[in-house]
C-alpha cells in the first residue's frame, strides 16, 4: 500500500509479488459513503500503471486483469474521478515481477594466510530483481556448521570471520550457498575442502640480499615466509628487462643461494609461497625487492683509434680515442682509463690515468717507433690492454681504397661504399670507417666517430652521431700489418641550398688582375656539403646579365684570382655557394675598379 | 577487563520461549566470538550457540532450528531466542567471549577468555 488508502483499498491477488509471466487481478473498491457526493452511480474508477490510464468502471470497484509486467517494480493507483471535480486519489499498490533465484555457481572459499579468516564467492545467475537472501554456511569437524546471511542486494562473497587452523590438515570442510526469496529457493552444490586446500599463504616480506665477499657469484636471498610454508618459487630479472628467470625450491627455510647474476645490474626479486606440493594455491607475489650486484672486473677490450698531425720537423700530435665498453663488459663503473706510452726500440714508457674523457692527446718525436696500450679500470680490476702501433695510416698509397662515395641512406644515415685497393686485396686485414664534422678550420677538437669493418665488407651504414644538413669527412682506411692507406670524401645524410653566400671582405689588384677574398658561410649555413663557390661579377649601372667564375669547394681556399676585368670600368661583384640541393642566395655585393691600363 | 551479566532465565512451561541477554561492560565486545553454554545438575557443560564479530552463527545440533543467537553491537548485548523449550533444556545458561580471533574450535569451553555469571532456566512439562 502506498498510502493512507482512507477511502478505498486496492487489493492483488495471487500476490504483491510474482513471477515473470503471471496474470494479476487488481481489484479497486470504495469504502462505504466515500464515493461521488450526491450520484453513487456516477462514481468513475480508474486504475492508472505509473501515469498511464489502463482501465475505469462506473460503480464502486473496479476489478482489471493484467498481464505482461516487465521485471522489477510496477506502481498501480486507483483514482476516482467526480463530475465538476479533480481526480481523488483512493489508494495503490506496488508489484514486484521476478524470477527464483538460479543455483548458485563456482562456490570457491579461500583463507588469505595462517592468520586470516575463511570468505566464499559463488556466481549468483541471473538477477532476480527481487530482494534475494543468501545463506552461506560451512560444516566441518564436531558436527559444527557456521551460517552467514548477506542481505546485501548483489551479493556473491561472504566472509566467515572464522580462522581456519592446521591441527587436523586433512579434515573435511563443506561450504554450501543457498539463495532464497519470495519466488523459491536454490542451493550451490557444495564445495568439499581441507584446510591446505583453500588457505593461500600470505606473500613472503622481510626479503633481503647478500653478497658474499662482495662478489656476485656468492649471493645468497633471504626471506621471512609464515610457518607452514614448503614451496617457494622465486622469480627474478635485471629492472630493464621484462623476462622473469623462474626458480623453485622446497624446504628452503627463507633462503636460497643464486649463482646465475650478473655484475653490476639493477636486478627486482620477488617470491611466492606454498603450503603443499599439490594441494592449495600460491600466494601473491611479495612485493619487489631492488639490489644492485656487486662489480666485477671488466671483460672484454676498448676499442681504439688514433689521428697523428704534423706539427714540425721534429715533432707530431697524437690524438687517442676510444669507446665506452659496453655495460655488460665494464660490469662496474669506470673509475679511469690507463693509457701507456711506449717507444719500442728505446723502451721509454709513460702511464697516464684518464677520467672524465674517452680521449688523450699529447706530442711525441716525429722519429722512433711508438705504441700504445689503454685499458679499462673499475674498483675490482682492469680490462686486458688494447695494443696499438702508431703508423703512418695513409701513407701506403697501394693501400687506398679505391672509388669511395657516400650516400644519404634514409634520415641521418650515410652509406659509405667503396672497392679495395689495386694491391693484393687480401692482404687488408680490417677497414676503418672515420667521419668527423667538416670545420674549415681543420679544428681537431672536432669529435671523432669510427667504426671498424671485416676484409671482405666494401659498404659501411654510418649512423652515429650524423645530423641533418651538416658535411661530414669521411675517410676509410685499409689496414695491413703496419701498413695503412687511406681515401677521404664529403658527405651528408640531408642538404639543402645554402643559407647564405660567402662574404666578400677583401678585394685587391695584382698585375692587371684582382684577387677576391671570403670568409667561409657559417657551418650552421651550409645545409650540407658545398660543391662550388660562384663568383659573379657586372658593370655598376648596367642591366646585363652578370658573368660567372665558377670554383670547385676546397675546404681551406678562401681566395680566387679573375683576370678578365676591363680597367677603369666600375663592376658589382658578389659570391654564392652551392650544394647538390642548389644555390644559396647573393653574399654582400662589393664594388671594385681596376686602376690598370688598357690593352 | 570484560564483565559478562546473563539475564532473562526463569521458569516457563514445555513448549514456551524464554529470551536471554548477555550484556558486556568494560570493553566494547563487537570484535569478540560469543558463545552460550549451559550445565545441567550432575552433567557436563555443553556448547549451545555462538555468534562471531561478522554476525556468522553456528549452534549444536540439540537446539538447531529451535534456538536463534543474535547480536546488537551499538548494546554490546548477544541474544539467545529460545522457542519450543523442553524439559531436557533445563539448565543453568552461561555465555562467554573470545577475545582472539574465531576459530573453528568455538564449541570447546576452553578457546573462551571472560564468562558470566550464568542465568537458570527450567521448562516444567
Known amino acids: 500500500k502506498i498510502d493512507a488508502c482512507k477511502r478505498g483499498d486496492v487489493t492483488v491477488k495471487p500476490s504483491h509479488v510474482i513471477l515473470l509471466g503471471s496474470t494479476v487481478n487488481i481489484t479497486c473498491s470504495l469504502k462505504p459513503r466515500q464515493g461521488c457526493f450526491h450520484y453513487s452511480r456516477r462514481n468513475k474508477l480508474i486504475l492508472y500503471k505509473f501515469d498511464r490510464r489502463i482501465n475505469f468502471h462506473h460503480g464502486h470497484s473496479l476489478n482489471s486483469q493484467v498481464t505482461g509486467l516487465p521485471l522489477g517494480t510496477t506502481l498501480f493507483v486507483c483514482k476516482l474521478a467526480c463530475i465538476n471535480s479533480d481526480e481523488i486519489q483512493i489508494c495503490g499498490a506496488e508489484i514486484f515481477v521476478g524470477v527464483a533465484p538460479e543455483q548458485p555457481q563456482n562456490l570457491s572459499c579461500i583463507q588469505k594466510g595462517e592468520q586470516g579468516t575463511v570468505a566464499c564467492t559463488w556466481e549468483r545467475g541471473r538477477d532476480t530483481h527481487l530482494y534475494t537472501e543468501y545463506t552461506l554456511q560451512l560444516s566441518g569437524p564436531k558436527n559444527l556448521t557456521w551460517q552467514k546471511q548477506c542481505k546485501d542486494i548483489y551479493c556473491d562473497y561472504l566472509d566467515f570471520g572464522i580462522n581456519l587452523t592446521p591441527e587436523s590438515p586433512e579434515s573435511n570442510f563443506t561450504a554450501k550457498v543457498t539463495a532464497v526469496n519470495s519466488l523459491g529457493s536454490s542451493s550451490s552444490l557444495p564445495s568439499t575442502f581441507t584446510f591446505l586446500d583453500i588457505v593461500r599463504p600470505l606473500p613472503p616480506w622481510d626479503i633481503r640480499i647478500k653478497f658474499q665477499k662482495a662478489s656476485v657469484s656468492r649471493c645468497t636471498l633471504y626471506w621471512r615466509d609464515e610457518g607452514l610454508v614448503l614451496l617457494n618459487r622465486l622469480r627474478y630479472r635485471p629492472s630493464n628487462s621484462r623476462l622473469w628467470n623462474m626458480v623453485n625450491v622446497t624446504k628452503a627455510k627463507g633462503r636460497h643461494d643464486l649463482l646465475d647474476l650478473k655484475p653490476f645490474t639493477e636486478y627486482e626479486f620477488q617470491i611466492s609461497s606454498k603450503l603443499h606440493l599439490y594441494k592449495g594455491s600460491w600466494s601473491d607475489w611479495s612485493e619487489s625487492l631492488r639490489a644492485q650486484t656487486p662489480e666485477e672486473e671488466p671483460t672484454g677490450m676498448l676499442d681504439v683509434w688514433y689521428m697523428k698531425r704534423h706539427i714540425d720537423y721534429s715533432r707530431q700530435q697524437i690524438s687517442l680515442f676510444w669507446k665506452n665498453l659496453s655495460v655488460s663488459e665494464a660490469r662496474g663503473k669506470i673509475l679511469h682509463y690507463q693509457v701507456t706510452l711506449q717507444e719500442l726500440t728505446g723502451g721509454k714508457a709513460m702511464t697516464q690515468n684518464i677520467t672524465g674523457h674517452t680521449s688523450w692527446t699529447t706530442v711525441i718525436p716525429r722519429t722512433g717507433n711508438w705504441a700504445v696500450a689503454v685499458s679499462a679500470a673499475n674498483s675490482k680490476g682492469s680490462s686486458l690492454p688494447t695494443r696499438i702501433n702508431i703508423m703512418n695510416l695513409c701513407e701506403a698509397g697501394l693501400l687506398a681504397p679505391r672509388q669511395v662515395s657516400a650516400n644519404s641512406e634514409g634520415m641521418d644515415n650515410i652509406l659509405v661504399t667503396w672497392q679495395p685497393p689495386r694491391k693484393d686485396p687480401s692482404a687488408v686485414q680490417e677497414y676503418v670507417v672515420e667521419w668527423r664534422e667538416l670545420h674549415p678550420g681543420g679544428d681537431t677538437q672536432v669529435p671523432l666517430n669510427w667504426l671498424r669493418s671485416r676484409p671482405y665488407n666494401v659498404s659501411a651504414l654510418i649512423s652515429e652521431n650524423i645530423k641533418s644538413y651538416i658535411c661530414y669527412e669521411i675517410r676509410v682506411y685499409a689496414l695491413s700489418g703496419d701498413q695503412g692507406g687511406c681515401s677521404s670524401i664529403l658527405g651528408n645524410s640531408k642538404h639543402k641550398a645554402p643559407l647564405s653566400g660567402p662574404h666578400i671582405n677583401a678585394i685587391t689588384e695584382e698585375k692587371g688582375s684582382i684577387l677576391i677574398s671570403w670568409n667561409s658561410i657559417p657551418v650552421q649555413e651550409q645545409m650540407g656539403c658545398l660543391l662550388h663557390y660562384r663568383i659573379y661579377w657586372k658593370e655598376r649601372d648596367s642591366n646585363s646579365q652578370p658573368q660567372l667564375c665558377e670554383i670547385p669547394y676546397r675546404v681551406s681556399q678562401n681566395s680566387h684570382p679573375i683576370n678578365s676585368l676591363q680597367p677603369r670600368v666600375t663592376y658589382v661583384l658578389w659570391m654564392t655557394a652551392l650544394t647538390a640541393a642548389g644555390e644559396s642566395s647573393h653574399g654582400n655585393e662589393r664594388e671594385f675598379c681596376l686602376q690598370g691600363k688598357a690593352n | 577487563q570484560l564483565q559478562l551479566v546473563e539475564s532473562g532465565g526463569g521458569l516457563v512451561q514445555a513448549g514456551g520461549s524464554l529470551r536471554l541477554s548477555c550484556a558486556a561492560s568494560?570493553?566494547?565486545?563487537?570484535?569478540?566470538?560469543v558463545g552460550w553454554f549451559r550445565q545441567a545438575p550432575g552433567k557436563e557443560r555443553e556448547f549451545v550457540a555462538a555468534?562471531?564479530?561478522?554476525?556468522?552463527?553456528t549452534y549444536s545440533e540439540f537446539v538447531k532450528g529451535r534456538f536463534t543467537i543474535s547480536r546488537d553491537n551499538a548494546k554490546n548485548t548477544v541474544y539467545l531466542q529460545m522457542s519450543s523449550l523442553k524439559p531436557e533444556d533445563t539448565a543453568v545458561y552461561y555465555c562467554?567471549?573470545?577475545?582472539?580471533?574465531?576459530?573453528?574450535?568455538?564449541?570447546?569451553?576452553?578457546?573462551?577468555?571472560?564468562w558470566g555469571q550464568g542465568t537458570q532456566v527450567t521448562v516444567s512439562s
Open positions: 562467554a567471549a573470545q577475545r582472539s580471533r574465531t576459530s573453528w574450535y568455538a564449541s570447546t569451553a576452553e578457546a573462551y577468555d571472560y
Open positions: 568494560g570493553l566494547t565486545f563487537s570484535g569478540y566470538t
Open positions: 555468534i562471531n564479530w561478522s554476525s556468522a552463527y
